[in-house]
């Protein structure tokens, strides 16, 4: 048995931040689980991890330098990514693993979400007027 995951096909990260919601066909509230977000077609970069255990507080971390936070819903985990760079525009995949109680469960690979990072439009500062000649 595999858990099904739904993600938005595409998100635009304005102001270099985005909320990516991973919706599961599974209730996580009474489980010990590891939800993670992976970057790239080959899911090579683990962007963020949300570790949950029904009796303890959620642990959220990134070992790859991403600024991330996570929120748990009944059948979802939302990743909040900040300080994204334009060159981090890519496809991102949600992954879920139920560690306990057994048996171990994970998800069918989802279609992923393309996150398009739009750079901040910095307004050019007006030219500083030079000293006026008398």
């Amino acid at each position: 048995n595999k858990i099904l995951v739904k993600q938005s096909p595409m998100l635009v990260a304005y102001d270099n931040a985005v909320n990516l919601s991973c919706k599961y066909s599974y209730n996580l509230f009474s489980r010990e689980f590891r939800a993670s977000l992976h970057k790239g077609l080959d899911s090579a970069v683990e962007v963020c991890v949300v570790y949950g255990n029904y009796s303890q507080q959620l642990q959220v971390y990134s070992k790859t330098g991403f600024n991330c936070d996570g929120k748990l819903g009944n059948e979802s985990v939302t990743f909040y990514l900040q300080n994204l760079y334009v060159n981090q525009t890519d496809i991102y995949f949600c992954k879920i693993e139920v560690m306990y109680p057994p048996p171990y469960l994970d998800n069918e690979k989802s279609n992923g979400t393309i996150i398009h990072v739009k750079g901040k439009h910095l307004c050019p500062s007006p030219l500083f007027p030079g000293p006026s000649k008398p």
Epitope: N1, Y26, Y54, P101, P103
Partner: antibody, heavy 121, light 107 residues
């Protein structure tokens, strides 16, 4: 179809031990947790613990630690519960039941027929 | 450990009536609750899982409701075959405690 076949009734002396069995069929034995439940005459159901044959994981109700020991034999798809130091308080019907995972919500949809244990001198 | 308080302990009703059995917990169990029926000399039978989901094959006169710490099993238009013992059980961690049971008798 899923079936849990439990061993027959036992009459045992105080202080003795007994081993009850629960033979599973109709599904992959190593993929499901088996729970054990006690029912004393005139009283309610009492949860003893569970055993997961896939990894030999066990959880006990603290009340039954030292009283019940859960094991399994994968080759015969059987889970065992040994009860030691028996007293009249252990006289009861003992059930095994399979835990199913309904998309993250647990329940016990399949039960054995129960084994009656009578402790008497 | 989670405490399960089931009430009433017993009730005597007539065929055709409606009954409600309640189960209270001392902390939020997020709907991780099942209801069982047990008849004398038989194994328990699962009626409802996840607090509100009726098991396939169980008559629709049985229904479950509730959330948080309070849950109910309702049986409408009671039939003679509905008499017996009813138990709730939580699955919010271990021990997976049962309620004390409700004995449903014919008046």
């Amino acid at each position: 179809q899923v079936k849990l076949q439990q061993s027959g009734a036992e009459l045992v002396k105080p202080g003795a031990s007994v081993r009850l069995s629960c033979k599973a069929s109709g599904y992959t034995f190593t993929e499901y947790i088996i729970h054990w439940i006690k029912l004393r005459s005139g009283q309610g159901l009492e949860w003893i613990g569970w055993f997961y044959p896939g990894s030999n994981d066990i959880q006990y109700n603290a009340k039954f630690k030292g009283k019940a020991t859960l094991t399994a034999d994968k080759s015969s798809s059987t889970v065992y519960m040994e009860l030691t130091g028996l007293t009249s308080e252990d006289s009861a019907v003992y059930f095994c039941a399979r835990r199913d995972d309904f998309s993250g919500y647990d329940a016990l949809p399949y039960w054995g027929q129960g084994t009656m244990v009578t402790v008497s001198s | 450990d989670i405490q399960m308080t089931q009430s009433p302990a017993s009730l005597s009703v007539s065929v055709g009536e409606t009954v409600t059995i309640t189960c209270r917990t001392n902390e939020n169990i997020y709907s991780n609750l099942a209801w069982y029926q047990q008849k004398q000399g038989k194994s328990p039978q699962l009626l409802i899982y996840a607090a509100t989901h009726l098991v396939e094959g169980v008559p629709s006169r049985f229904s479950g409701s509730g959330s948080g710490t309070q849950y109910s099993l309702k049986i409408t238009s009671l039939q003679s075959e509905d008499f017996g013992n009813y138990y709730c059980q939580h699955f919010w961690g271990t021990p997976c405690t049962f309620g004390g049971g409700t004995k449903l008798e014919i008046k």
